[in-house]
């Protein structure tokens, strides 16, 4: 799903207040709900009818440093016999997410939000049409 | 997928530098890759063998203000005949994502990162075993 454009209004102070100096604002250290857990370590990527693999990208100047991308293993979907059914399609499910980019010059460190497109997994769909003649 | 704990080291200055004052840091206005777009197949939520609906949550003090959550429509998966196959299960694909929380008292505005668990869509899986006793 798509993150709407910021329009930068979200990060502005109310009109009656003095403007933010130098085009930056205060970001508190710490993360709300940091201990929240995903209950998904169940190998669904292998047991799905539209299975996928994971690739990890690593960037020490990004938070989170590790971003995991899914790639569908097949074009078709896997049927009950474990064979690829090419009348159905494995398609990626994508999600826009935010990361934080760290920029530093010596002891001057600043941060900026960055939008990243993540493929989270795959799902099996019926194609809209089979052939265009 | 799970976002690792910050350990707060990411947001710290190098050891040789003076510490961040007041437990906050500088966040630049603007978002990198703001114009990037999701290129997901059309209506996959309805054409999937594990279809889902979307619910939108709205919070003006969160960026993005709109967070979309998927809910699987069925327990089983939809077969080629359009019937629910109860030997297969529709399961959610979940992703931890970051949002920005805005906190203000009068003209003093600060921001904090928050982890949110988003269900992005659903996929069809074969359960490992039939019964646990």
């Amino acid at each position: 799903r798509k993150i709407p454009k910021v329009g930068h209004t979200f990060f502005q102070k109310p009109e009656s207040c003095p403007p933010v100096p130098g085009g930056s604002m205060k970001l508190d250290i710490g993360i709300i709900n940091e201990n929240q857990r995903v209950s998904m370590s169940r190998n669904i990527e292998s047991r799905s009818t539209s299975p996928w693999n994971y690739t990890v990208t690593w960037d020490p100047n990004r938070y989170p440093s590790e971003v995991v991308q899914a790639q569908c293993r097949n074009l078709g979907c896997i049927n009950a016999q474990g064979k690829e059914d090419i009348s159905m399609n494995s398609v990626p499910i994508q999600q826009e997410t935010l990361v934080v980019r760290r920029k530093h010059q010596g002891c001057s460190v600043s941060f900026q939000l960055e939008k990243v497109l993540v493929t989270v997994g795959c799902t099996c769909v019926t194609p809209v049409i089979h052939h265009v003649q | 997928r799970k976002i690792p704990k910050v350990g707060h080291t990411f947001f710290q200055k190098p050891e040789s530098c003076p510490p961040v004052p007041g437990g906050s840091m500088k966040l630049d206005i603007g978002i990198i890759n703001e114009n990037q777009r999701v290129s997901m197949s059309r209506n996959i939520e309805s054409r999937s063998t594990s279809p889902w609906n979307y619910t939108v949550t709205w919070d003006p003090n969160r960026y993005p203000s709109e967070v979309v959550q998927a809910q699987c429509r069925n327990l089983g998966c939809i077969n080629a005949q359009g019937k629910e196959d109860i030997s297969m299960n529709s399961v959610p694909i979940q992703q931890e994502t970051l949002v920005v929380r805005r906190k203000h008292q009068g003209c003093s505005v600060s921001f904090q990162l928050e982890k949110v668990l988003v269900t992005v869509g659903c996929t069809c899986v074969t359960p490992v075993i039939h019964h646990v006793q």
């Epitope: 169940r42 | 609906n53 327990l75 019937k83 629910e84 299960n89 529709s90 959610p92 359960p127």
Partner: antibody, heavy 123, light 106 residues
């Protein structure tokens, strides 16, 4: 220990609605499906439907669509079923029964049962 | 819907007898479960996936069959086996149960 504690017996008038609940303990409520089963007096068991709190998925027996509505309250680990437009045919004992998690065990595998709630429809 | 027909609807047998209950499905199913419901109690899973014994169930109970015809057998009937037995198909939506077989001791 897994426990499913159902609400008490109900005596309701024809045309009315009733909501029966199933409070759970001893397991992570969100991760398992909850099914509802009807047993008319001394008769066969009929599966009404099931709901999974984690996925949001619901599955109904077509014979009960429009008659039964299944809901969950994650905060209290409680599943509920509302029955509407009741007639004497709806007089029965209704069971909640835990199904699988969808990952390791199939959603439709029933292992634990509540003690049953008797619903009597009478004017 | 797949219809499940049990036979007999009721039966009376003596302690130590071998008892057989059959369940016929209106179309082919992959798996059959059997439940035992003692008077005034909730149903309890007895046999799952046609032939697997549920936890805590005595070995005198067994299940077999395939396709449309399935059988529950009690090799040596005990007084505590007085109950109604239900078959349940787990193949096609919706889940369906047999009408039940009421077992009594002579």
């Amino acid at each position: 220990e897994v426990q499913l504690q159902q609400s008490g017996p109900e005596l309701v008038k024809p045309g009315a609605s009733v909501k029966i609940s199933c409070k759970t303990s001893g397991y992570t409520f969100n991760e398992y499906t909850m099914h509802w089963v009807k047993q008319s007096h001394g008769k066969r068991l009929e599966w009404i439907g099931g709901i999974n709190p984690n996925s949001g998925g619901v599955s109904y027996n077509q014979n009960f669509k429009g008659k039964a509505t299944l809901t969950v309250d994650k905060s209290s680990s409680t599943a509920s079923m509302e029955l509407r437009s009741l007639t004497s045919e709806d007089s029965a004992v209704f069971y909640c029964a835990r199904g699988g998690d969808g990952y390791y065990t199939n959603y439709f595998d029933i292992d634990y049962w509540g003690q049953g709630t008797s619903v009597t429809v009478s004017s | 819907d797949i219809q499940m027909t049990q036979s007999p609807s009721s039966l009376s047998a003596s302690v130590g007898d071998r008892v057989t209950i059959t369940c016929s499905a209106s179309s082919s199913v992959n798996y059959m479960h059997w439940y035992q419901q003692k008077p005034g109690k909730v149903p309890k899973l007895l046999i799952y996936d046609t032939s697997k014994l549920a936890s805590g169930v005595p070995s005198r109970f067994s299940g077999s069959g395939s396709g449309t015809d399935f059988t529950l057998t009690i090799s040596s009937l005990q007084p505590e086996d007085v109950a109604t037995y239900y078959c349940q198909q787990w193949n096609s939506h919706p889940l369906t149960f047999g009408q039940g077989t009421k077992l009594e001791i002579k």
